[in-house]
Amino acid sequence: GALEVQVPEDPVVALVGTDATLCCSFSPEPGFSLAQLNLIWQLTDTKQLVHSFAEGQDQGSAYANRTALFPDLLAQGNASLRLQRVRVADEGSFTCFVSIRDFGSAAVSLQVAAPYSKPSMTLEPNKDLRPGDTVTITCSSYQGYPEAEVFWQDGQGVPLTGNVTTSQMANEQGLFDVHSILRVVLGANGTYSCLVRNPVLQQDAHSSVTITPQRSPTGAVEVQVPEDPVVALVGTDATLRCSFSPEPGFSLAQLNLIWQLTDTKQLVHSFTEGRDQGSAYANRTALFPDLLAQGNASLRLQRVRVADEGSFTCFVSIRDFGSAAVSLQVAAPYSKPSMTLEPNKDLRPGDTVTITCSSYRGYPEAEVFWQDGQGVPLTGNVTTSQMANEQGLFDVHSVLRVVLGANGTYSCLVRNPVLQQDAHGSVTITGQPMTFPPEA
């Protein structure tokens, strides 16, 4: 008879830049040896070879050297594939083809996703506004995938659908930048909110702008930064937004701009004497020189690290002075948890087992939840430890001690509190006696 190959029914969702595991398992017969196994992972639609195992040997990756099997688990029937540094172009269906004597295959879908940045809001015109003026509010959110859904609403939560134009452009990596434009006639004052939704991650990124039409008071330079922290994924680039309103006749020769760490005054980047003085922060910062004259003093911070987290002050002096601080919140998604069982064979109801759930390289520290097959939380006999590596990323290990019933499913959920990203793993223990793992 045909060989039964099992893969998850639901698509595997993976964040761009992270690693994904495409689970695939088969049930080896007694006396099975790896010399008998022929395993092929291929793209379902094109049959392009991705990875193979034959003649008792891992034949390696045929897919940009970004794939790996789990060699220690193959003999137990675990044919799962690890895909590293996921890209948008990886999205699609992968077939796991196993032949021993009989043949079996199954396809698993990979759904790629990337969270959208917190939207930035710009206003045109942006000064001397009076009730009755028509303004254009632009909401821009960057580097997300797949395409976003964009919603506008007013301060009372009423949707604004008229006079909205939304465009989405993919960059070289396939990530989308979304720009949505709302044209509105100003009342006495008003709040306008833009929500950018990632339909796969069910992640909502929102920003709002409150417009009080009147002349700004003269005197100090009004420097504007986002109220909410800027959330940036480790390894990506972040824009710390800062703007001021240049007066008529303003020239860059008059501008003195300093970005510094709020708590230490450590210089990050400066612009003086009409010139960009460059980065004083590990050469990972840049201004937007073409936009400075319009009052855009934003700072681009490249290849964000955990150590970058904190408050940055944007200090502007022309004749008057102005400054404001913006917070950078660094985040990294946790990997899909791996589950291990101790002891892992000849298990019977009444046995006490230790289930370990491990998830890697996330930030900030995770929240870990356990539950049984009915969704009932398991809080007793849980020990969770989190250790930071040299880059400040956390590996989380949570251990549940449980007495086995006739059968049972145990699920572990690792939540990133900043990204509101949940990574879960589960193990189902059935029958008696049994051996773990029965599948990936």
């Epitope: 003195n256 300093i258 510094q260 708590d263 230490t264 005054k265 450590q266 210089l267 400066s270 003086t272 004497e273 003085q277 004083a280 002050t313 200090f315 002096s317 004749r319 002075f321 400054s323």
Partner: antibody, heavy 118, light 109 residues
Framework: EVQLLESGGGLVQPGGSLRLSCAAS????????MSWVRQAPGKGLEWVAG????????YYADSVKGRFTISRDNSKNTLYLQMNSLRAEDTAVYYC???????????WGQGTTVTVSS | QSVLTQPPSASGTPGQRVTISCSGS????????VNWYQQLPGTAPKLLIS??QRPSGVPDRFSGSKSGTSASLAITGLQSEDEADYYC???????????FGGGTKLTVL
Amino acid sequence: EVQLLESGGGLVQPGGSLRLSCAASGFTFSSYWMSWVRQAPGKGLEWVAGINRNGGTTYYADSVKGRFTISRDNSKNTLYLQMNSLRAEDTAVYYCARWNDYDIMDVWGQGTTVTVSS
Amino acid sequence: QSVLTQPPSASGTPGQRVTISCSGSSSNIGRRTVNWYQQLPGTAPKLLISNSQRPSGVPDRFSGSKSGTSASLAITGLQSEDEADYYCASWDDSLNTWVFGGGTKLTVL
């Protein structure tokens, strides 16, 4: 009215210790960096030490590093300067100054005199 | 020796215009705010000018300017009560210290 009032100065022997205080009023103390500046008799102004809003970052002049400690208690609106291993050259009027976001020491106290002599 | 360089003395007659210079470097005056303080005999220093901005209460006879790594304080219509010591100061983000000029003693003849 915005005010800074220093206290704790006096006569001390070389090698001795002294703790200066600066009581702030009329503004939100915890929103500002603060500094100590001194002036030896007949000489110019010399910055001594500075501290950030929450006390987590401190900076010192080379001449006092390792001997003086700046600290603050935001709940009491008070700035401190703990001076140990005092030397004759530390004799001066010590001023506390508010250090605003624009790198301006805009408000100064009236000063307290420290004399180090045997 | 001070990090910021000022002339030790300046003088003028009532009604005259005098200027006091202050020279620094790119890590202080070059990109940071330059402050001018007036110290009358026996009193605490008082903020006079920041770059070119006067705090309220400072007469408009006092003005400041900054160019590159140098700054200057100008006093027009000199008055006898202007006789004092004048200091320039700036935060230095390389040294992580405030730096002062040595002070200029202004005499009204």
